[in-house]
């Protein structure tokens, strides 16, 4: 999929909502200039496309939500890449600017053909994209045209700044909260010396910055901090791993504020360099409980502790999604490509038949095989519902007593819609309350996951705790099985009695050498020895001085 031909999924309606999903992986470094995207993605791509289509169907059939108004959508592929997403957002804007009287918009239909839609409706709002860096670029464009944007997984703290990102909202919390959760885990296990890695880009950079700031306040030292692009080559990952190895055996814990594919790159490098079991990775929600991160590299990932946004599976989505087949799905223009990629077979005779596969797909194939629901599915659906409720509230206030779109609502004013969205308050897909604070952010609840070997060659993520509004709960026995197994990640061991810490010039405060005080000195504080005054001597525990008792010599006393 390259820049000259972009596929769009379109669903007709009275009001059109735009969406940006990473239907394909980002371009590899050598393909960035031509914006040629990678392989099709299931969880982050196809499932989210289907979630949009089916959620709109549910909204449209709900008589209490936007009665007499049909919501439609236009879904575009962001490829998890700023340049591609910007190009696609410009298309959204173009649609909004083209007047139906002046020009016809050309759209790529879900069946793959080109078709002219007279009076192409403008996009009233945009759902997504997933990546913070990409969301920022998209927001910079959308806000110029007063188009509200609701994100489902862009968690960067920068996006809370309403002076910069006025039309941005999200159904997920800011990363400041998960940075705090990560620091709380490090504190809990007394890891005072850790290495740090983050994905180059806004998500990783701002998240790691918060992690480092909070760590410093808690007396946690960062051995060294590294950054790397998610799509960096093998050599870059190998180089990074060698640097991390240089801090062993002291910095065993590696805090990774990373996108999932960065973690996968690290795991692959561990395999190449034979470093399985050398590190314990503490990962942010970019990793969470994704199997596409660990598949094939489970041994390297074992022990990993990850943060996952709390979002239970959505049953009704699976009921819908697992029935989909190439014969039953022609509104999703990427579905045939995905089916062939998923089952490594050729859909013989179908419009998007891929001849690179030798085997023909047979009728017994089903998505039920090895199905894993996108971990952020609930957020995607909540973002779509937020847009619907915002429009519903707007319609109620602008068109009282009127079912459908009244003249006062046409064309939809983005400023009024934003106001309405910010006041939205409804019960989300998992029964939780969805609301937005003054920054357009949602409250934060996280699950703590642990990647474990459950049996011979069987690995899985286990829920070992939670972090909710500043409170960390962990099942230590589940993580470590016994206290002695707790990994140590410290630069220097505590000094013995009568010793002080000497920090070498240029070293962090967690690394020291222990030096004993002189015979007449006591430990004044952990860094200083002080001599006892004349007539006094260090106490047995060397924490102070006792006066030397005066002994008078008598004529008959033996020689001392």
């Amino acid at each position: 999929q390259s820049s000259e031909r972009r596929v769009v999924a379109h669903m007709p309606g009275d009001i059109i909502i735009g969406a940006l999903f990473s239907v394909h992986h980002q371009p590899t470094v050598d393909k960035v200039h031509e914006r040629k995207c990678g392989a099709v993605r299931e969880q982050y791509g196809i499932q989210r496309v289907e979630a949009m289509l089916h959620t709109l169907e549910r909204i449209n059939s709900d008589p209490t939500l936007l009665p007499n108004i049909t919501l439609g959508c236009e879904i575009r592929d962001s490829c998890w890449h700023s340049a591609v997403a910007l190009e696609q957002s410009i298309e959204f804007i173009r649609d909004s600017l083209i007047s139906s009287e002046e020009e016809e918009g050309l759209v790529r239909c879900v069946d793959g053909s080109s078709s002219s839609f007279r009076s192409k409706k403008p996009i009233v709002g945009v759902i997504g994209p997933g990546s913070s860096s990409v969301a920022i670029q998209v927001q910079n464009l959308l806000q110029l045209f007063n188009i509200p944007q609701i994100a489902y997984s862009a968690t960067s703290m920068d996006l809370s700044d309403k002076t910069l990102f006025k039309y941005f909202m999200r159904v997920v919390p800011s990363d400041a909260q998960q940075a705090r959760a990560m620091v709380d885990i490090v504190k809990r296990y007394n890891w005072t010396y850790v290495s740090a890695v983050h994905t180059e880009g806004n998500y990783g950079e701002s998240g790691m910055e918060a992690f480092k700031d909070m760590s410093a306040k808690e007396g946690i030292c960062i051995a060294h901090s590294y950054k790397i692009y998610s799509n960096a080559g093998e050599q870059s990952f190998d180089k990074l791993l060698k640097k991390l190895t240089s801090h062993l055996p002291k910095a065993r814990v590696v805090a990774c504020f990373c996108e999932g594919m960065t973690v996968r790159g690290l795991l692959m490098a561990m395999r190449r360099l034979g470093l399985a079991g050398e590190f314990l990775l503490l990962g942010s929600d970019g990793w969470a409980d994704r199997y596409d991160v660990t598949d094939g590299y489970q041994r390297e990932a074992v022990g990993g502790i990850t943060i996952k946004l709390q979002s239970p599976d959505v049953k009704w989505f699976d009921d819908y999604y697992l029935k989909l087949r190439p014969e039953t799905n022609h509104r999703n223009p990427w579905f045939q490509e995905f089916w062939q990629h998923r089952f490594q077979c050729r859909l013989e005779g179908f419009p998007q038949e891929n001849s690179k596969y030798n085997k023909t797909c047979n009728s017994s194939l089903t998505l039920k095989t090895h199905h894993v629901q996108d971990s952020k599915m609930g957020f995607v659906i909540n973002a779509i519902y937020s847009m619907a409720y915002g429009l519903h509230n707007m319609q109620m206030s602008l068109c009282p007593g009127y079912a459908g779109l009244c003249d006062a609502m046409k064309p939809i004013d983005g400023r009024k819609l934003l106001e309405s969205l910010m006041k939205t308050n409804f019960t989300g897909v998992s029964g939780d309350t969805i609301l937005f604070d003054e920054n357009g952010d949602s409250p934060g609840r996280y699950e703590i996951m642990n990647f474990k070997e459950m049996g011979k060659d069987y690995f899985d993520y286990i829920n070992v705790g939670s972090w909710d509004n500043g409170e960390l709960k962990m099942d230590d026995d589940e993580v470590w099985s016994k206290k002695s197994n707790i990994i140590r990640s410290v630069c220097s061991e505590p000094c013995e009695k009568g010793q002080i810490k000497v920090i070498r010039k240029g070293e962090v405060s967690c690394c020291w050498t222990c030096t004993p005080c002189k015979e007449n000195e006591y430990v004044f504080d952990e860094y200083t020895c002080k001599a006892c005054q004349l007539g006094s001597w260090p106490t047995d525990d060397l924490t102070g001085c006792d006066l030397i008792p005066v002994q008078y010599l008598r004529w008959g006393d033996p020689e001392p």
Epitope: D111, K323, E327, T328, R331, L347, E348, G349, C361, S363
Partner: antibody, heavy 117, light 110 residues
Framework: SLEESGGGLVKPGGTLTLTCTAS?????????ICWVRQAPGKGLEWIGC??????AYNANWAKGRFAISQTSSTTVTLQMTSLPAADTATYFC?????????????WGPGTLVTVSS | AYDMTQTPASVEVAVGGTVTIKCQAS??????LAWYQQKPGQPPKLLIY???TLASGVSSRFKGSGSGTQFALTISDLECADAATYYC????????????FGGGTEVVVK
């Protein structure tokens, strides 16, 4: 082979259930079983299909009044409600077995349904 | 919605002649098209699937072609036994369909 049964005379507004029975094979999870009808002197009209035992799909015009279900490993039914005279036709069931797509390679002889008062 | 348009509705051809029936899909279906032959009082019989593949036991005088939205069935060296009604059917999708079959073409052999 396939054989349809349950056809006959029914009054307008009535309900009728047709059954498609397989002989020599049973409906597995990879079969498409479809219903097609043909009004006297007219062309073939696709009603809908069922894939496996649960997933049924109807033509746009057949949604609501026509329901396809698998009742056993060798029978599939077509339930028709609120029948108008225009539903008078020969009803065929047909099977697709093979790769993706649903070309119908095995047909039953058909059963005639007459809707008249 | 998917529907199929078949032309002509009826055609008369002499024995030994050639006839071409056309079928148009409203949206692209790749090569997922089948052709059936139906004689009075009988169920349809599959002739061609995947636009051009002959079903087993079908004479090579029947030839299917096309892809995307435009398809054709050509019968050469017509025989009296070929007198029948021929239908095309899109065999790609089972959702959002008005009719999977074309309207039919009656072939009369003189």
């Amino acid at each position: 082979s396939l054989e349809e049964s349950g056809g006959g005379l029914v009054k307008p507004g009535g309900t009728l259930t047709l059954t498609c029975t397989a002989s020599g094979f049973s409906f597995s999870s990879s079969y498409w079983i479809c219903w097609v009808r043909q009004a006297p002197g007219k062309g073939l009209e696709w009603i809908g299909c069922i894939y496996g035992s649960t997933d049924a799909y109807n033509a746009n015009w057949a949604k609501g009044r026509f329901a396809i279900s698998q009742t056993s490993s060798t029978t599939v039914t077509l339930q028709m409600t609120s029948l108008p005279a225009a539903d008078t036709a020969t009803y065929f069931c047909a099977r697709h077995d093979g790769d993706i797509g649903w070309t119908l390679d095995l047909w039953g002889p058909g059963t005639l349904v007459t809707v008249s008062s | 919605a998917y529907d199929m348009t078949q032309t002509p509705a009826s055609v008369e051809v002499a024995v030994g002649g050639t006839v071409t029936i056309k079928c148009q899909a409203s949206l692209t279906i790749g090569t997922r098209l089948a052709w059936y032959q139906q004689k009075p009082g009988q169920p349809p019989k599959l002739l061609i699937y995947k636009a051009s593949t002959l079903a087993s036991g079908v004479s090579s005088r029947f030839k299917g072609s096309g892809s995307g939205t435009q398809f054709a069935l050509t019968i050469s060296d017509l025989e009296c036994a070929d007198a029948a009604t021929y239908y095309c059917q899109q065999a790609a999708y089972v959702t959002d369909i008005d009719n999977a079959f074309g309207g039919g073409t009656e072939v009369v052999v003189k």
